[in-house]
Each structure stands twice: as C-alpha cells, then as structure tokens.
C-alpha cells in the first residue's frame, strides 16, 4: 500500500511482498525487502520499545537504496503495520502483517500490565478499547465489570476491528471500573489486558464575564475582567482570551480553580485578565473562551475607553412630557458620560427628594401624577471626577379629563314646580378645556328604573335613547346658553347652562363634556311636580349653628296629609349615573320628622324647623302630600346644604406703597369665611373714619384715599372679623413731596 503524495521525480519505495495484508504463522521468519531511489528507513510495530534487538534491518547486497527487514521467530505481538519510507519525506509503502498466534490472539501493550481508556458520556459518542488482534477474523466480545456485563458486536455501533480494537457507545461502559476484550478460539477463551475506564467530563454549563456589560474607563485606569466557567465534574479547562491590543505591556492573566461546596455536581474555573493602565487602543471587544476539549463556550463584552471624564445629555432626552391625571410618569435622564454622573432633579428650582409618591433617580418617577405636578423639571448631571455640570429642562403637562363639579354637590332627585323657568348648570373642569359640552335629554317615563329591568354599573340606564336638546319635541322648551368661563376655587372652569323655559314634563338631562384625554358626564333628574312646593326660610344655604325652616306649602282643596321626611342613608349606594328609585314608591328609606302645621285662606303650610343646623342635617328632605280625590301620593324633594363655619381669611396681601402728594391710593381687601366676616380698616391702629377724602366701598372691601396729603402716611390695617375670630393684613403707605398750601391758608 502506498502512503503520501509522490513527488515529481521519485517513485514510491517498492516492497518485495506486493500485498496490503500479509498473514503468517507465529515462530516463522518475516522478511521484507524495500527498494527505492534514495535513502530508506523502516518503521515497525513497537519499534519504540526494546523489541528492536530481534529486528534486523540490513543493506541489500545487490544495489543502492535497498533495505531488508528480518524478524526471526515472529510472535503475535509483531502484528501491525510495517512501513518503508524515504527519509525526510511522506513517501512510504506499508504492509499490514498478522502474526497468527492462537495462544495470544491480542497484541499486548507496551506495559503489559493494564491500559487506560478515557470516555465522555456525550450523545452519539463511541469509545475504542485498543485490543488489537494478531488474527483478523476473531469473534471478540467486550467484558465490563463490575457488575459483569458482556457486549458482542451488533453490526453497527458495537464492533471489533483487529487493527483498531473494540468500538462501543461510551454510555454502555461508563458504569464500569474496568474492561477487557475476550476471544474464543476452539472453545478456549483468551483475554486482552485490562483497561481502566476513566470517565472524563466535558460539559461546560456556562461562561460568565464580570463585569458583563457597560464597562467604561478613562485612559490610565485599571481594567479587571473575570471569566468564570462552570462545568461538570472531571473537567479540565483551557482559557483563551481575545482582546484589541494583544501586544500589551501591562497585561496580566491569572487562571485558577475555584472551590465549590462539597457534594456539588459542578466545578468552577476562573481566569482574570488585568490591564494596569488602559489606553485608547484597549477599547474594543474582549472575548473569553473556555475549552474542555470536546466543548468550547465563550462570552464577550465591550470595553469603552474614554480620553477623559465627561458628561452630556443623550439625544433622546425629552423636553415635553404629557400625562393624564392618575398615570405613572417616567422621565428618564438619558445621558452619555464617564463615570456615571450624579443626578439631581429640581421642580421649579426646588430640589426633589424621593418619597412614596415620587422617585428621583436615573428616572424621575411620579407614581400617580396630579395637576400640582405640572411644571418645569430640571435635571442636573454632575461628573463626579471633573465636576462638570449639564442641565436640561423638561416641561410636564398634566391633562385632566373633564370633571363636572355639580356631580358631587347636587341631589339627583330634586323636584321642580310645574310651569317654572329653571336653569340647569354643568361646571366643567378639564385640562385642556373641553372642546365641546353637549346637552341631551329624554322623557322620564321612557327611562323609568323598574326593578325588573337589569341595571349595571357599566350600563346604568335601561334606556339609552338620548336626544339632542335641539330636538325638544314632546319635552320642555330649551335654550342652551353660550359657555361661560369662570375662575372658581382658583381654577379656570367652563360653565354650560341650559334654560328650561317652562317646566312642563319630567325628563332626564345629560351634559357631556369631552377633551383630548377623556369625557365626563352628569345626568340630572328633572322631576316636574304640580304638588306641594318647598321653600327655605330665611336662606337657601344656612351655615352651621344658624336656624332654618323648611316650609311645605300645598293647596288645601287638592292635598291633605302633609308630612315631612328625611331621606335616610341608602341601604345600597347609588352608583355613578344610576337613577334613584322614586322616593314616593320607597318610603322604607324615609325618616318621618316632627313639623308644625299652619294654614291660611288657601294653603296648608307644614313647617319643619332646624335649630342650630349642623353638618349632619344636610341631605334630602321630602314633603309628601296626598291627593284628596285620587289618594295618590305626591313627593317633593329638596336638598339642604349646610355650610361649614370657616374662620375669616384674607386673600392677597396689602402692598407697601409710595405715593406722591395729591395722587390717589386705591387698595382692596378681599376676605372670605362663613359666616361672612365684617371688614374694618385702621390707620396706625386707630379706626379709620370716612371723610371726603377717605372712601370705603363694597362692604369696606375697597379703600380709596383721594388727593393724598402728608398726614395720610402711616400703617394701614385691614381686619376681617366674625364670631370665629379675626384676620388682618398690613401695609405702610409713604407719601412723598412737599405739602402744597391750600387757599384757606
């Protein structure tokens, strides 16, 4: 057989036995001559051992470049490949010789004691036990122990080859401590040497770099990268690093095994790469590869090297953030910088501190945004090394879906006297202001809330046939006034009013307000009654501790049995937008009240008096009257609101001012409180008395000093007092210039 590529001028060495395989018996002489065209050498099995004393290589007597190999009394162990080759080339001729020794069918190893086979238990992996044969066609099985198992060739993955040995799937013998080959010749068993089985791991579970990402340094700093490989047991690991600047003077690599807990099914290996002073050329990808021979796993990270410390805002930094009330707002501070900057947030110039509602860090998070969060937020980045600062302003606009103020104030069951003109109001607060407020209506009987009809929170009305107020056929004549804008409780609100010219039919009215972030609606139950009429004496809205009388007046010829009730707490709360059950049909929720009856020529008047009204007296009061003929009950409901007592407060400050003689001074002092406070003015702690030059108007709210004189200079005090106390503000008026002489002088 020929091995190697023939050169242009050289022929292959020629053997005297022109066969690939030669079979001879033991104890005979093996002699092969090799001829060629230049210096030749022989290689034979075991020729690295001491057996060459038996092997004789001689020069041929009949020519140059010829050598004869002779082995007298060959034994089984001489089985193998015999190669004749030209020195310093790959050109060779090979013959495989079987020395049939039936007493020793397996070729013994060099040590003749035992061999070692290394196996890995990965998928589709076979192992070769090198029990070579001196006979080519033996029936060989493999014995493994302990426990004892015998494996015979199955024609595929289990096989024996005299030149190679016994091949078997690794997993089949991984349990064994030792294996050997066995051949049967004429009922006689022959065994190879023993092979110790060593299971070698190969699995690498993972390779982790630390730090794993976002590594940034500036020139001159030290880089330390740790690469940890986790493997199964019985594994050895080789680490290999790839990095941008391979010819680094200050590079240091340290590899070591890490201790793992006893009983752990895992090993850990660590490789540490250190570069003492990085340069710009050290920027780039760093890759750590861990190899176990059968498996390689790698991991990479990018190292960024900056010329010097710096800080800047990233291009994605927002300048305007829009949100709706109740949302979570996140404003990230997007920056470029090394090292990471210190981040400080300010709102309208005031530093923000984190609490349960706001988190001020890399990201400014407002958990549930409210209107008061609207404003300008400034983020200041400070580089911790260079102290360089960068600032950026973010405007936060908080939108509010339409909220209708009266929703929470007005009872949904007020009654209105037949034929009267009534005004219904929706006061809408929204940011941005509503782009429209529309009114709708429908007849009360079309939407009667019968208990049999299913009403849910998602569909509060059994009828949804709302009609536009432009189409008032069959209903009350309506006029919608142009929207008004008013500053109420310090907020710009939109007021939409609907005027019912004559209250003729009971209906439901709905106002719907819409802006860019939502909608709000209010349903008003407009119940028209021809029955009793309720009035309040002396005031529509009494204050706590004041007395109030509720008068129920009914035509004596039509009605009888006038009774006052108070609507008690609902056993089931009315859901938003749900229609209440008509009170006359459900007297269970009413509390009967004591009242006094008076009469005049045409009417009965039932008066219910509340002395020292309290906040608990607020609620819906029902006057019930019975039709004398039909005995049908008529109810009128009036909501009573009791105003809370509030101590006086003065809104706005009096400003110190300087005025020239002869000019005028006008100042105002607006006070609020309940009961409304009395306003008094003082000059230098003396009560200010009106005269021709000093004018007090609007319940003393406005003070005017005409043609000021030098003696008008001084400390002016506005004091607002009620039974609940006083509030005051002060200002100093300076009068400049020389006093003009008057004519009288």
């Amino acid at each position: 057989a020929s091995v190697g590529l023939p050169s242009v001028s050289l022929d292959l060495p020629r053997l005297s036995i022109q066969k690939d395989i030669l079979t001879i018996k033991a104890n005979t002489t093996l002699q092969i001559t090799c001829r060629g065209q230049r210096d030749l050498d022989w290689l034979w099995p075991n020729n690295q051992s001491g057996s060459e004393q038996r092997v004789e290589v001689t020069e041929c007597s009949d020519g140059l470049f010829c050598k004869t190999l002779t082995i007298p009394k060959v034994i089984g162990n001489d089985t193998g490949a015999y190669k004749c080759f030209y020195r310093e080339t790959d050109l060779a001729s090979v013959i495989y010789v079987y020395v049939q020794d039936y007493r020793s069918p397996f070729i013994a190893s060099v040590s003749d004691q035992h061999g070692v086979v290394y196996i890995t238990e990965n998928k589709n992996k076979t192992v070769v036990i090198p029990c070579l044969g001196s006979i080519s066609n033996l029936n060989v099985s493999l014995c493994a122990r302990y426990p004892e198992k015998r494996f015979v060739p199955d024609g595929n993955r289990i096989s024996w080859d005299s030149k190679k040995g016994f091949t078997i799937p690794s997993y089949m013998i991984s349990y064994a401590g030792m294996v050997f080959c066995e051949a049967k010749i004429n009922d006689e068993s022959y065994q190879s040497i023993m092979y110790i089985v060593v299971v070698v791991g190969y699995r690498i579970y993972d390779v982790v770099l630390s730090p794993s990402h976002g590594i940034e340094l500036s020139v001159g700093e030290k880089l330390v990268l740790n690469c940890t490989a986790r493997t199964e047991l019985n594994v050895g690991i080789d680490f290999n690093w790839e990095y941008p600047s391979s010819k680094h003077q200050h590079k240091k690599l340290v590899n070591r095994d890490l201790k793992t807990q006893s009983g752990s099914e895992m090993k850990k290996f660590l490789s540490t790469l250190t570069i003492d002073g990085v340069t710009r050329s050290d920027q780039g990808l760093y890759t750590c590869a861990a190899s176990s021979g059968l498996m390689t796993k790698k991991n990479s990270t990018f190292v960024r090297v900056h010329e010097k410390p710096f800080v800047a805002f990233g291009s994605g930094m927002e300048s305007l953030v829009e949100a709706t009330v109740g949302e979570r707002v996140r404003i990230p501070a997007k920056y470029l910088g090394y090292p990471p900057p210190e981040i400080k947030w300010y709102k309208n110039g005031i530093p923000l501190e984190s609490n349960h509602t706001i988190k001020a860090g890399h990201v400014l998070t407002i958990m549930e945004v409210s209107e008061r969060d609207t404003g300008n937020y400034t983020v200041i980045l400070t580089n911790p090394i260079s102290k360089e600062k960068q600032s950026h302003v973010v405007s936060l606009v908080v939108y509010v879906p339409p909220q209708i103020g009266e929703k929470s104030l007005i009872s949904p069951v007020d009654s209105y006297q037949y034929g009267t003109t009534q005004t219904l109001t929706c006061t809408v607060y929204a940011i941005p202001p509503p782009h429209h407020i529309h009114w709708y209506w429908q007849l009360e009987e079309e939407c009667a809330n019968e208990p049999s009809q299913a009403v849910s929170v998602t569909n509060p009305y059994p009828c949804e046939e709302w009609r536009s107020v432009e189409d008032f056929q069959g209903g009350n004549k309506i006029e919608v006034n142009k929207n008004q804008f008013a500053l109420i409780e310090g907020k710009n609100k939109t007021v939409s009013t609907l005027v019912i010219q004559a209250a003729n039919v009971s209906a439901l009215y709905k106002c719907e307000a819409v802006n860019k972030v939502g909608r709000g609606e209010r349903v008003i139950s407009f119940h028209v009654t021809r029955g009793p009429e309720i009035t309040l004496q002396p005031d529509m809205q009494p204050t706590e501790q004041e007395s109030v009388s509720l008068w129920c007046t009914a035509d004596r010829s039509t009605f009888e049995n006038l009774t006052w009730y108070k609507l008690g707490p609902q056993p089931l709360p009315i859901h938003v937008g749900e229609l209440p059950t008509p009170v006359c049909k459900n007297l269970d929720t009413l509390w009967k009240l004591n009242a006094t009856m008076f009469s005049n020529s045409t009417n009965d008047i039932l008066i219910m008096e509340l002395k020292n009204a309290s906040l608990q007296d607020q609620g819906d009061y029902v006057c019930l009257a019975q039709d004398r003929k039909t005995k049908k009950r008529h109810c009128v409901v009036r909501q009573l609101t009791v105003l809370e007592r509030v101590a006086p407060t003065i809104t706005g400050n009096l400003e110190n001012q300087t005025t020239s003689i002869g000019e005028s001074i006008e100042v105002s002092c607006t006070a609020s409180g309940n009961p409304p406070p009395q306003i008094m003015w003082f000059k230098d702690n003396e009560t200010l008395v009106e005269d021709s030059g000093i004018v007090l108007k609007d319940g003393n709210r406005n003070l005017t000093i005409r043609r000021v004189r030098k003696e008008d200079e001084g400390l002016y005090t506005c004091q607002a007092c009620s039974v609940l106390g006083c509030a005051k503000v002060e200002a100093f008026f300076i009068i400049e210039g020389a006093q003009e002489k008057t004519n009288l002088e």
Epitope: E121, K123, K149, D154, N156, Y171, M172
Partner: antibody, heavy 115, light 110 residues
C-alpha cells in the same frame, strides 16, 4: 430478536397496553423505542425507554402514551385511544445516546380503534 | 422537528441511480445524527445508513449517504429490482423529544 403483541380492536377511550418481548438483548445496555405506522402512511416515532429506565416521548405523544419495562419486556400504554391511533406499532432496539438509530425491529402489531 | 423528503415517488431503471433528499427544519445533533431506513410492504423498516454516511452492517455498498446539518441525501447507484421500497430518513436532535421521521419516498424500479 424483538416481537410485539397485544394489538387488537378497541373502542375509543379504552386504554390499551402493547408488549414488546426481547430475547438475546440486554435491556440494561440497550434502549428500546416504539414507532407506529398508520395504514398507508409514514413512520412516526413515539418514544424511547433508556437502559436505565428513563423515558422520552415525541412532543406530539406526551401525555398520550406511557412506556415502561421489565428485564425482558417493554410495554407501551395508549392511555385514551382515538381513531387516529389506528396503526401498526413497532418496537425497535436502539441506543440511549443515539435516539435516531434503530438496528433491530419487530414485525409489528396492529391496533384498530373504532366505535 | 420536521423532516421533508423529496421527491415522492421516484422512478428508476435497473442499473440507474436514485437520489433521495431529506431536509430538516433544524440542524440535527452533531450535524450528522441522521439515519436512513428501507421498508417493503408488510415488513418492518431496515437500517441502511447511520451517522448520515456510515453504512450499516450487511447493507450493500451501492447505498450511500451524505450531507450535514439540515440537508441530507441517500444515493442508490446501480439500482436493482430488490431496491423497490419506501425509504425514510430519521433525525435526532439536541432535544430527543424532537426526534422525527421524514414523510417517506417511494422508489419504483422499472
């Protein structure tokens, strides 16, 4: 050698167990797989039981079949047969570490599922 | 995994060459865990090739296999009448549960 048995006509939903009996094969060294073939259709690998008794099923077969073994037999239980399970079921010898190689097959046993 | 065999059926004259392709939806384990089987009517399948290209014992050397990863080929050169059968490829994967046969290719010998 390998031989399957237990194939018969069953009604849908009635559990059925097929048995594969081996001789001259050491089940503590070899893995055994079950493969089926619907009439006029191709082969479908069902699952394998390893020499150590671990089982693995084709993704489509999980929950529908159970494989178990003794020292000389390997069972395939069809938990709740449907008409789609009508097929010839083969038992084949393979290797723990090489699921996609079967070098000894049984002749097969026919299962018919019909109401 | 899905193994797609093409073409089917395939027709060949005695002495001709037949090539059957098998494409896998994902790479087989070790790029070579693919075997080929021959099945004749009424008989169980018979192993022809494993490890994509290793001839099973007792199989004539006119059968050969090639390919790696996702594309594999079974070639029958010098087709004989006895080669008329259906041929299946079988792939093994990282996850044993993905093991699957191809749909089969019927070889008709004229």
């Amino acid at each position: 050698s390998v031989e399957e048995s237990g194939g018969r006509l069953v009604t849908p939903g009635t559990p059925l167990t097929l048995t594969c009996t081996v001789s001259g094969i050491d089940l503590s060294s070899y893995a055994m797989s079950w493969v089926r073939q619907a009439p006029g259709k191709g082969l479908e690998w069902i699952g394998i039981i390893s020499s150590t008794g671990n089982t693995c099923y084709a993704n489509w077969a999980k929950g529908r079949f159970t494989i178990s073994k003794t020292s000389t037999t390997v069972d395939l239980k069809i938990t709740s047969p449907t008409t789609e399970d009508t097929a010839t079921y083969f038992c084949a010898r393979g290797y723990d570490d090489y699921v996609a190689l079967f070098n000894m097959w049984g002749p097969g046993t026919l299962v018919t599922v019909s109401s | 995994a899905v193994l797609t065999q093409t073409p089917s059926p395939v027709s060949a004259a005695v002495g001709g060459t037949v090539t059957i392709k098998c494409q896998s939806s994902q790479s087989v384990y070790n790029n070579n865990a693919l075997s080929w089987y021959q099945q004749k009517p009424g008989q169980p399948p018979k192993l022809l090739i494993y490890d994509a290209s290793t001839l099973a014992s007792g199989v004539p050397d006119r059968f050969s296999g090639s390919g790696s990863g996702t594309q594999f080929t079974l070639t029958i050169s010098g087709v004989q009448c006895d080669d008329a059968a259906t041929y299946y490829c079988l792939g093994g994967y990282d996850d044993d549960a993905d093991t699957a046969f191809g749909g089969g290719t019927e070889v008709v010998v004229k």
